[in-house]
């Protein structure tokens, strides 16, 4: 894995990524930026879109590229899977062309793993938003992971993804 | 229609302090950030400071840092430049610029600009 | 700093000619890249984004390309509208930074 200065995790400076799930990050981030400084000022451009509210994924999957998910364990970043992409570009774009602009070649959703398997970790995010949320009352953290079965231990419930992390170390997918 | 207005500018001694100021309309003001970009007589375009559409944010050139702060008033939809310690070569036609751009940043919309000028 | 470095400073053409104005950043920038068009006495204004996504309004003789450190400005006819000065500038990384421009004059 390398050095451990190299794979040090830095808190999340930045106020929008804030309370999204998970508070470490580690740059470059996934469109090369080396400051958290210089993914906020970029970060900031899509305000009107997240004001619109097109997606209701959409400032997750935006912190996921600009200041992805670090963990001391494991030596690279973790993003956003391809199909958050998707979803959100397809909630998304339409509203970008009525501002007058493309959607960004950065956020190309084929760059992204298509999903979370054991080659390509990614974060899939709060789920397909055409689908209701199965609870209709608040979870309290750390009661889903029961539903995994008798691994239950190996998990930690993930507030903003609303599903089951893998805890590192683990052999298995990072989610459920 | 989008619009932004720039005042403020005029005379000033080397030392002396200006503050701009840019009043926005057409667009919802609190969703963008602002930026200044100033052009020296026959010179090019220099960016000067950027803020975010929160307010929370706040980046300069090093030019500028530590003499210059920008700020805004969104129940004004104004922004300002706060210009201290000015020097000469801080001569210049100062532009308000909305930056946008959806993941790079990009002005927009420019003001028509104010000038500053900066002698004995 | 990342510096920009445009070529040439200014060039003399005729209307109906094409025109490459050249942009080049000083460390990758990816596609980080935009142009403006000034008139004298005029605010600039914004014509291509993101190196090569010409922006709303803007005509199609507009066009740009290029990634990492070299980019390109073509007009594909130049129009009496077009003589102007030309800037990129990047928005990789802070400071924003300008190329010094080029001035696009009548032959």
């Known amino acids: 894995f390398g050095d451990e200065e190299e794979r040090r995790c830095d808190p999340i400076r930045i106020s929008m990524c804030q309370n999204l799930g998970y508070n470490v990050t580690k740059m470059p981030n996934l469109v090369g930026h080396e400051l958290q400084t210089d993914a906020e000022l970029q970060l900031t451009t899509f305000t009107p879109l997240i004001q619109y509210g097109c997606s209701s994924q959409l400032q997750f999957f935006l912190c996921s590229v600009y200041v992805p998910m670090c963990t001391e364990k494991i030596n690279i970043p973790i993003g956003p899977c391809g199909g958050m992409c998707l979803s959100v570009k397809r909630r998304c774009e339409p509203v970008l062309k009525e501002f007058g602009f493309a959607w960004p070649e950065s956020l190309n959703c084929s760059k992204f793993p298509p999903q979370n398997d054991h080659n390509h970790m990614c974060m899939e995010g709060p789920g397909d938003e055409e689908v209701p949320l199965p609870h209709k009352t608040p979870i309290q953290p750390g009661e889903e992971c029961h539903s995994v079965g008798t691994n239950s231990d190996q998990y930690i419930w993930v507030k903003r993804s609303l599903n089951c992390v893998l805890k590192c170390g683990y052999d298995a997918g990072l989610y459920s | 229609e989008v619009q932004l207005v720039e005042s403020g500018g005029g005379l000033v001694k080397p030392g002396g302090s200006l503050r701009l100021s840019c009043a926005a309309s057409?667009?919802?003001?609190?969703?963008?950030?602002m930026s200044w970009v100033r052009q020296a007589p026959g010179k090019g375009l220099e960016w000067v400071s950027a803020?975010?559409?929160?307010?929370?944010?706040?980046y300069y050139a090093d030019s500028v840092k530590g003499r210059f702060t920008i700020s805004r008033d969104d129940s004004k939809n104004t922004l300002y430049l706060q210009m201290n310690s000015l020097k000469t070569e801080d001569t210049a036609v100062y532009y308000c610029?909305?930056?946008?751009?959806?993941?790079?940043?990009?002005?927009?919309?420019w003001g028509q600009g104010t000038l500053v000028t900066v002698s004995s | 700093d990342i510096q920009m470095t445009q070529s040439p400073s200014s060039l003399s053409a005729s209307v109906g000619d094409r025109v490459t104005i050249t942009c080049r950043a000083s460390?990758?920038?990816?596609?980080?890249l935009n142009w403006y068009q000034q008139k004298p006495g005029k605010a600039p204004k914004l014509l291509i984004y993101?190196?090569?996504s010409l922006q709303s309004g803007v005509p199609s003789r507009f066009s740009g390309s290029g990634s990492g450190t070299d980019f390109t400005l073509t007009i594909s006819s130049l129009q009496p509208e077009d003589f102007a000065t030309y800037y990129c500038?990047?928005?990789?990384?802070?400071?924003?930074?300008f190329g010094g421009g080029t001035k696009v004059e009548i032959k």
């Open positions: 460390q990758s920038i990816s596609s980080y």
């Open positions: 057409g667009f919802t003001f609190t969703n963008y950030a």
């Open positions: 500038q990047q928005s990789y990384s802070t400071p924003l930074t």
């Open positions: 803020i975010s559409g929160s307010g929370g944010s706040t």
């Open positions: 993101a190196a090569s």
């Open positions: 610029a909305r930056a946008t751009g959806f993941g790079t940043v990009v002005f927009d919309y």
